[in-house]
């Protein structure tokens, strides 16, 4: 029986050009984690494997940093980074646990502040 649960940072927002840490935590199971995959929609961002360590997908190498822990740091955020992110824990013997994080990348606070008070 898969008794575990994944706690995530949930819905988060960050400023364009900034960085954000995506984090998941697996609890309530004795299962042992062999690998964690980080995905954005259907794109693989990174893998943390028990033997091989971290692998960052080539297309994200410049903007993705491993850690802290099994988490992932996204840097130089753009509005296009807005969307769903998934942490996929491959565990023995339970199998796969998936956590979801929704990231919204906002225009810089100055721009956002200006837009908010614009007179039509």
């Amino acid at each position: 029986m898969m008794t575990g649960t994944i706690e995530t940072t949930g819905n988060i927002s960050a400023e364009k050009g900034g960085s954000i840490i995506l984090q998941c935590h697996l609890s309530s199971t004795t299962a042992q984690v062999t690998q964690v995959n980080w995905e954005q929609q259907d794109q693989l961002l990174a893998i943390c494997n028990a033997d091989l360590g971290w692998h960052i997908s080539p297309s994200f190498k410049d903007r993705v940093a491993p850690g802290p822990g099994l988490g992932l740091t996204l840097q130089s955020l753009t509005v296009n980074d807005t969307g769903e992110y998934f942490c996929i824990y491959h565990t023995y013997p339970d199998g796969t646990y998936t956590g979801r994080i929704f990231l919204e990348v906002l225009e810089s606070s100055v721009a956002e502040h200006g837009a908010r008070f614009q007179i039509p």
Partner: antibody, heavy 119, light 109 residues
Framework: QVQLVQSGAEVKKPGASVKISCKAS????????MNWVRQAPGQGLEWMGW????????TYAQKFQGRFTFTLDTSTSTAYLEISSLRSEDTAVYYC????????????WGQGTLVTVSS | QAVVTQEPSLTVSPGGTVTLTCGSS?????????ANWVQQKPGQAFRGLIR???GRGSWTPARFSGSLLGGKAALTISGAQPEDEAEYYC?????????FGGGTKLTVL
């Protein structure tokens, strides 16, 4: 390369205890679970349970709760199976196998340890 | 406890294709059963061939493939070799424990 090397054959009297070892090499011991499986003469394979090598927490199959104990020595990358109050029906070959969570299952196996219980 | 069934024995010609199956007394086998296939050659240790229904070990030859077929787990050997002659055991995961089948003795003749 990954290897699981088990201790040698044991002959014990009923009521005695035995402790068999499974020494792992070629990978980080605490990253993968360790299973114990037995095969009695002329019988099939039975999964006894597994131990989380990171936390040290054992999980026993229902049939193997009580007289069977899984332990670890992480400093030597060794898993142990201890059986107390041995009975003749404990005569079997005992195997350790590594538990992998990426495509769930048992990937590497030890060569087996024959335990014979006889008066 | 569930009973896992395999063909007791099968024969294949060298270069031929053979499918070994693994059924469950509880109903159709699914991906949640994480079907495993383990090979044992005479006088040798067990070797994990397939994990998680269709995941090959890094040492598993490409001619071995795992799948679900008609409600059972299946191991297909395409282009059997003499060295494939062995006993093959399947194991299925049932929520909190593994159950092994009785094994299939494969002869390459």
């Amino acid at each position: 390369q990954v290897q699981l090397v088990q201790s040698g054959a044991e002959v014990k009297k009923p009521g005695a205890s035995v402790k068999i070892s499974c020494k792992a090499s070629g990978y980080t011991f605490t990253n993968y679970g360790m299973n114990w499986v037995r095969q009695a003469p002329g019988q099939g394979l039975e999964w006894m349970g597994w131990i989380n090598t990171y936390t040290g927490e054992p999980t026993y199959a229902q049939k193997f709760q009580g007289r069977f104990t899984f332990t670890l020595d992480t400093s030597t990358s060794t898993a142990y199976l201890e059986i107390s109050s041995l009975r003749s029906e404990d005569t079997a070959v005992y195997y350790c196998s590594r538990g992998n969570g990426y495509y769930v299952g048992m990937d590497y196996w030890g060569q087996g340890t024959l335990v014979t219980v006889s008066s | 406890q569930a009973v896992v069934t395999q063909e007791p024995s099968l024969t294949v010609s060298p270069g031929g294709t053979v499918t070994l199956t693994c059924g469950s007394s509880t109903g159709a086998v699914t991906t949640s059963n994480h079907a495993n296939w383990v090979q044992q050659k005479p006088g040798q240790a067990f070797r994990g061939l397939i994990r998680g229904t269709n995941g090959r070990g890094s040492w598993t030859p490409a001619r071995f493939s795992g799948s679900l077929l008609g409600g059972k787990a299946a191991l297909t050997i395409s282009g059997a070799q003499p060295e494939d002659e062995a006993e093959y055991y399947c194991a299925l995961w049932f929520s909190n424990h593994w159950v092994f089948g009785g094994g299939t003795k494969l002869t390459v003749l």
